[in-house]
């Protein structure tokens, strides 16, 4: 595939990545799938600056990111190492709370109203952010 050198229409460029901010809500798995279909992934936060950038664009609204522990340990969707990476959980989080009555615990991470992270039920219809890196190989075939 060809290398992507600029962001698609309606995406925002920042530090060699492109971001797309939803204005509707989806369950985490549906949001994850949406990003994949766009040759992207749910946002992976790797620094203070990226946290602040995303926060600036989403405002005080619950918004999914590409972090989950549906298979046990917390994992970023692009393979970024969770243990050594940037974290910004709210106090007392993640807590895998079972008291919501929706079955199971809480396996998906989202930005809260103050920007810090919380784990929640993956079925909740929150907004989401897609991210794709510039200069990575696109899945689209090159134009002839």
């Amino acid at each position: 595939g060809s290398e992507r050198t600029c962001c698609p229409v309606n995406w925002v460029e920042h530090e060699r990545s492109c971001y797309w901010f939803s204005r509707s809500g989806k369950a985490w798995a549906d949001a994850d799938n949406y990003c994949r279909l766009e040759d992207a992934h749910l946002v992976v936060v790797t620094s203070w600056e990226e946290q602040k950038f995303v926060q600036h664009h989403i405002g005080p609204v619950n918004t999914w990111m590409g972090l989950h522990d549906q298979n046990g340990p917390w994992k970023w969707v692009d393979g970024t190492d969770y243990e050594t990476g940037f974290k910004n959980w709210r106090p007392e989080q993640p807590d895998d709370w079972y008291g919501h009555g929706l079955g199971g615990g809480e396996d998906c991470a989202h930005f809260t109203d103050d920007g810090r992270w919380n784990d929640d039920v993956c079925q909740r219809p929150y907004r989401w952010v897609c991210e794709t890196e510039l200069d990575k190989a696109s899945q689209e075939p090159p134009l002839l």
């Epitope: 600056e49 602040k52 950038f53 926060q55």
Partner: antibody, heavy 119, light 107 residues
Framework: QVQLVESGGGVVQPGRSLRLSCAAS????????MHWVRQAPGKGLDWVAV????????YYADSVKGRFTISRDNSKNTLYLQMNSLRAEDTAVYYC????????????WGQGTLVTVSS | DIQMTQSPSSLSTSVGDRVTITCRAS??????LHWYQQKPGKAPKLLIS???SLQSGVPSRFSGSGSGTDFTLTISSLQPEDFATFYC?????????FGGGTKVEIK
């Protein structure tokens, strides 16, 4: 009401160490990040360091990196600044400030403690 | 590191005057710009966070605006208690940095 009280300042010789403390009350200390900011006599404000509410992340100004260590004891509601290899240019009033979670601004400040580095 | 340039460094003005202080960042900081007031011998006090959010208890004559690299603090009608030094600070990227300050003095 939110109260922050710094202590531990004093006169110290260049190359020596000092530990500052900031005692917090009037809020849930363990839920907030905290900053150290300093001000040399007659000069402007100079950010020193920040620590997350649980100590998981710490950031420093270039001028103190490798010499100063920010830490906290949530069981004692106390913030610390360990200052090693002190220099004359570290002479300042040192303030602690509470971090506003959304903006990272210092929303409440202590009254400061004076550190003088002199031989 | 992000440099914050404040201007003017000092100004002499009178009670009732409109005062404007500017702060420029060396790169975009979005809206992560905050304004503090400091009186002699006292700790700084947060006036405005996130470029334009007035802190609780701060008089409405203070206002902030701007985004990206250019920001402004305005005092619509200066009062006697407003004579002080004002600082801007960015919290977009560590190390967090302050402007050099603007001293507002009585003419």
């Amino acid at each position: 009401q939110v109260q922050l009280v710094e202590s531990g300042g004093g006169v110290v010789q260049p190359g020596r160490s000092l530990r500052l403390s900031c005692a917090a009350s009037g809020f849930t200390f363990s839920s907030y990040g905290m900053h150290w900011v300093r001000q040399a006599p007659g000069k402007g404000l100079d950010w020193v360091a920040v620590i997350w509410y649980d100590g998981s992340n710490k950031y420093y100004a270039d001028s103190v990196k490798g010499r100063f260590t920010i830490s906290r004891d949530n069981s004692k509601n106390t913030l610390y600044l360990q200052m090693n290899s002190l220099r004359a240019e570290d002479t300042a009033v040192y303030y602690c400030a509470r971090d506003d979670p959304r903006s990272s601004a210092g929303d409440y400040w202590g009254q400061g403690t004076l550190v003088t580095v002199s031989s | 590191d992000i440099q914050m340039t404040q201007s003017p460094s000092s100004l002499s003005t009178s009670v009732g005057d409109r005062v404007t202080i500017t702060c420029r960042a060396s790169q975009s900081i979005f809206s992560y710009l905050h304004w503090y007031q400091q009186k002699p011998g006292k700790a700084p006090k947060l006036l405005i966070s996130a470029a334009s959010s007035l802190q609780s208890g701060v008089p409405s004559r203070f206002s902030g605006s701007g985004s990206g690299t250019d920001f402004t603090l305005t005092i619509s009608s200066l009062q006697p208690e407003d004579f002080a030094t004002f600082y801007c600070q960015q919290t977009y990227s560590p190390p967090l940095t302050f402007g050099g300050g603007t001293k507002v003095e009585i003419k």
